[in-house]
Interface confidence: low
């Protein structure tokens, strides 16, 4: 299977939620010595390598993120995220997101998605998608977040 | 060596339209967002429009929103400018972007009866 | 939208003298990729802007060491150290953390 990214670029208004969605394409390896791991951190944009550092999401790193079938894998020894506006979700056609709730200039960034699969006897195999962020400050909440196919190459100053 | 040279500038008169184009050349057109800016007579520089590389998506300020509309020609390695509905207040110098590292010459828009 | 304030709006100086110019952001301009995306424009007289420097303290290429940014967050500086007749016009400091793009609205550098 592979990932993908529905929209590699949002623009969101100050104050608005944002989801930003993952897809797991083609079949997924299924069996008791199986298991997959889907979970979310942010990276650094400008990279050859993308999505190759990790960054904590609002201070929740990937470990705290996993999803876990539908629903968020809680750790009882850390603050629960949706306690800090992070919600994950996830379906059984291959699509999972983070919502960021009320969004800030500071959540902008480059995220990333992670899919691990672990097989009994075989290497791990790590799939990633990126998509980047931008919270534009001060908007009113009137609009809503905008999703494009685009990649911002233009707001990076090259050396 | 990145170029950008803009053309279509002129007079104007209030509630007309104009369209001003950008020809870029020097480095890969179609994997660059784009951008107007402008800057009044004595005045700053201002973002007035942006445009995804493919063109799929565009994005305005407030003051411009509605009335300019931002396009590009990937084929033809051109990026355009469509104003409509000018004002007085929008009678700048109107310069074609790759972010704020490469700029045009500017093509004056005068918008006066 | 992201505030630049910039100060002084002119300056007037000597040929050998060196200024300092600042820009002051209404946000932290840090990216979450811990780079932070200020730059400097110049735009001599009848010309259009020209990057000077990029990412706070960069120099764009062809621009001579006597062009130094300083700064960190909201809070940066352009100096310039022995002032030539060439670096004559208007300064810009110029944020593409956030978007949209906005711009300090300028210091006027003249002879004195």
């Known amino acids: 299977f592979k990932v993908t990214t529905p929209y590699s670029l949002y623009v969101c208004p100050e104050g608005q939620n944002a989801t930003l969605t993952c897809r797991i394409l083609g079949p997924v390896s299924k069996g008791h010595d199986v298991t997959i791991y889907k979970t979310w951190y942010l990276s650094s944009r400008g990279e050859v390598q993308m999505c190759k550092e990790h960054r904590p999401i609002r201070n929740f790193t990937l470990q705290h993120l996993q999803h876990h079938g539908s629903h968020l894998k809680a750790n009882a020894s850390h603050d629960q995220p949706q306690k800090h506006g992070l919600e994950l979700a996830s379906d059984h056609h291959g699509n999972f997101s983070i919502t960021l709730r009320n969004v800030t200039p500071r959540d902008s960034g480059l995220y990333c998605c992670l899919v691990i699969e672990l097989k009994n006897h075989h290497p791990e195999q790590r799939f990633y998608g990126s998509m980047e962020l931008q919270v534009q400050a001060g908007k009113g909440s009137g609009s809503t977040c905008m999703a494009s196919n685009e990649q911002d190459s233009d707001s990076i100053t090259a050396a | 060596e990145v170029q950008l040279v803009e053309s279509g500038g002129g007079l104007v008169q209030p509630g007309r339209s104009l369209k001003l184009s950008c020809v870029a050349s020097g480095f890969t057109f179609n994997k660059y967002w784009m951008s107007w800016t402008r800057q009044a007579p004595g005045k700053g520089l201002e973002w007035v429009a942006s445009?995804?590389?493919?063109?799929?998506?565009?994005y305005y300020p407030d003051s411009v929103k509605g009335r300019f509309t931002i396009s590009r020609d990937n084929a033809q390695n051109t990026l355009y400018l469509q104003m409509n509905s000018l004002r007085s207040e929008d009678t700048a110098t109107y310069y074609c972007?790759?972010?704020?590292?490469?700029w045009g010459q500017g093509a004056m828009v005068t918008v006066s009866s | 939208d992201v505030v630049m304030t910039q100060t002084p709006p002119s300056l007037s100086v000597t040929i050998g003298q060196s200024v300092s110019i600042s820009c002051k952001s209404s946000?932290?301009?840090?990216?979450?990729?811990?780079?932070?995306?200020l730059h400097w424009l110049l735009q001599s007289s009848g010309r259009s802007p020209k990057r000077l420097i990029y990412q706070v303290s960069n120099l764009a290429s062809g621009v001579p060491d006597r062009f130094s940014g300083t700064g960190s967050q909201k809070d940066f500086t352009l100096k310039i150290s022995r002032v030539e007749a060439k670096d004559l016009g208007v300064y810009y400091c110029a944020q593409t953390t956030h978007f949209p793009y906005t711009f300090g609205a300028g210091t006027k550098l003249e002879m004195k």
């Open positions: 445009i995804t590389n493919s063109g799929g998506n565009t």
């Open positions: 946000q932290s301009l840090v990216y979450s990729d811990g780079k932070t995306y």
């Open positions: 972007t790759l972010g704020v590292d490469y």
